[in-house]
């Protein structure tokens, strides 16, 4: 009778279904929706995340102006194709053969199309651009506070090592927090700065993706931090491909 | 990149033996723990053997024990599972996997494609 058997649940990924069946009675998790082996050390990839949540019952500032190419996921849910590693398939396709291709967060970033539609790989989003509006407090949260806060939550709570957080930018109510990492950045072992954004995103949300832990408790030199809007804009290494008629929509 | 290539699988009457290798490459083979884990038609996947890096300490699921052997040669890249006594229920696509274990938990982060045992008489 081991630890494992006691506590056999994954610390950071509640949307599985664990087991003391690996060796030596160890604790062994799978996701739902795939029942793809997962690593409860780490974040899991969004990917299987997405898959496991559809298959459970259910001008001079210092703030950045998100390029002309970067993308908003506009397109809501669906139930990903991941790969045998847990990342997106670069092309994802509905029950009605509608196939469109994703980057490496699983966002489009084509026109639509049907089961003839290619997409060569899959490109990687190497900036993220994470911009949150919080409610009114009594003043301005300090700059330098607010940066040390948001960056200690990347790397304690989504163990996003800090060289990724590129910057924390604020002007009231506005907070831009900017994630980058290209492929050849990021090592074997290093979170990706899309999962990190996704547990990010699901934990303002009051969705927390942790297991058994509280929801997010942001504070400020004690004063709580509450969000009221989140917008991510996701940047590809390789511009998307849309048409003008999307484009002038 | 991480490639895992298995061979040996077939046919075999109960009672038969077989024995799988696991041909590894893209990765530091001689650090790494490995696994043979099974999916039986219409069923999950199931851990069946586990061998730590260098070879000193193997686990094995219920159902094997006692019939089942793995081992590893280190010069060689390979992962090998010596298969004995086979009965019908041993029927699946046998896949190697690169592994890791904690204290308290296991888990596989790269499988072969896998090849395919049919216990049958």
């Known amino acids: 009778h081991t630890a494992a058997q006691d506590n056999c649940t994954c610390p950071t990924n509640k949307m599985t279904v664990c087991s003391p069946d690996g060796p030596g009675g160890r604790c062994q998790c799978r996701a739902l929706g795939s029942g793809m082996a997962v690593d409860c050390s780490t974040l899991t990839s969004k990917c299987l995340l997405l898959k496991a949540r559809m298959s459970a019952p259910k001008n001079a500032r210092t703030l950045v102006r998100p390029s002309e190419h970067a993308l908003v996921d506009n397109d809501g849910l669906y139930d990903p194709d991941c790969d045998p590693e847990g990342r997106f398939k670069a092309r994802q396709c509905n029950q009605t053969s509608v196939c469109w291709c994703v980057n490496s967060v699983g966002v489009r970033r084509t026109d639509k199309g049907d089961l003839s539609l290619r997409c060569d790989e899959l490109v990687r989003t190497h900036h993220i651009l994470i911009d949150l509006r919080h409610r009114p407090t009594a003043g301005a949260f300090n700059h330098s506070d607010l940066d040390a806060e948001l960056r200690r939550l990347f790397r304690e709570r989504y163990r996003l090592h800090p060289k990724f957080v590129a910057a924390v930018h604020y002007e009231q109510p506005t907070i831009q927090i900017e994630l980058r990492q290209n492929t050849s950045q990021k090592a074997a072992g290093d979170v990706d700065i899309g999962d990190a954004a996704y547990y990010f995103e699901r934990d303002i949300k009051g969705e927390s993706l942790f297991q058994g832990r509280g929801g997010l408790d942001l504070r400020v030199r004690g004063e709580p931090l509450q969000v009221e809007r989140t917008l991510i804009y996701y940047l590809d290494e390789i511009p998307p491909k849309f048409s003008m008629k999307r484009l002038t929509a | 990149q991480v490639q895992l290539q298995e061979s040996g699988g077939g046919l075999v009457q109960p009672g038969g033996s077989l024995r799988l290798s696991c041909a590894a490459s893209?990765?530091?083979?001689?650090?790494?723990?490995m696994s043979w884990v099974r999916q039986a038609p219409g069923k999950g996947p199931e851990w069946v053997s586990y061998?730590?890096?260098?070879?000193?300490?193997?686990y094995y699921a219920d159902t094997v024990k006692g019939r089942f052997t793995i081992s590893r040669d280190n010069s060689k890249n390979t992962l090998y599972l010596q298969m004995n006594s086979l009965r019908a229920e041993d029927t699946a696509v046998y896949r190697c996997?690169?592994?890791?274990?904690?204290?308290?938990?296991?888990?596989?982060?790269?499988w072969g494609q896998g090849t395919m045992v049919t216990v049958s008489s």
């Open positions: 061998i730590n890096a260098d070879g000193s300490k193997t």
């Open positions: 996997a690169r592994a890791k274990l904690t204290d308290t938990h296991y888990v596989e982060d790269y």
């Open positions: 893209g990765f530091p083979f001689s650090s790494a723990d």
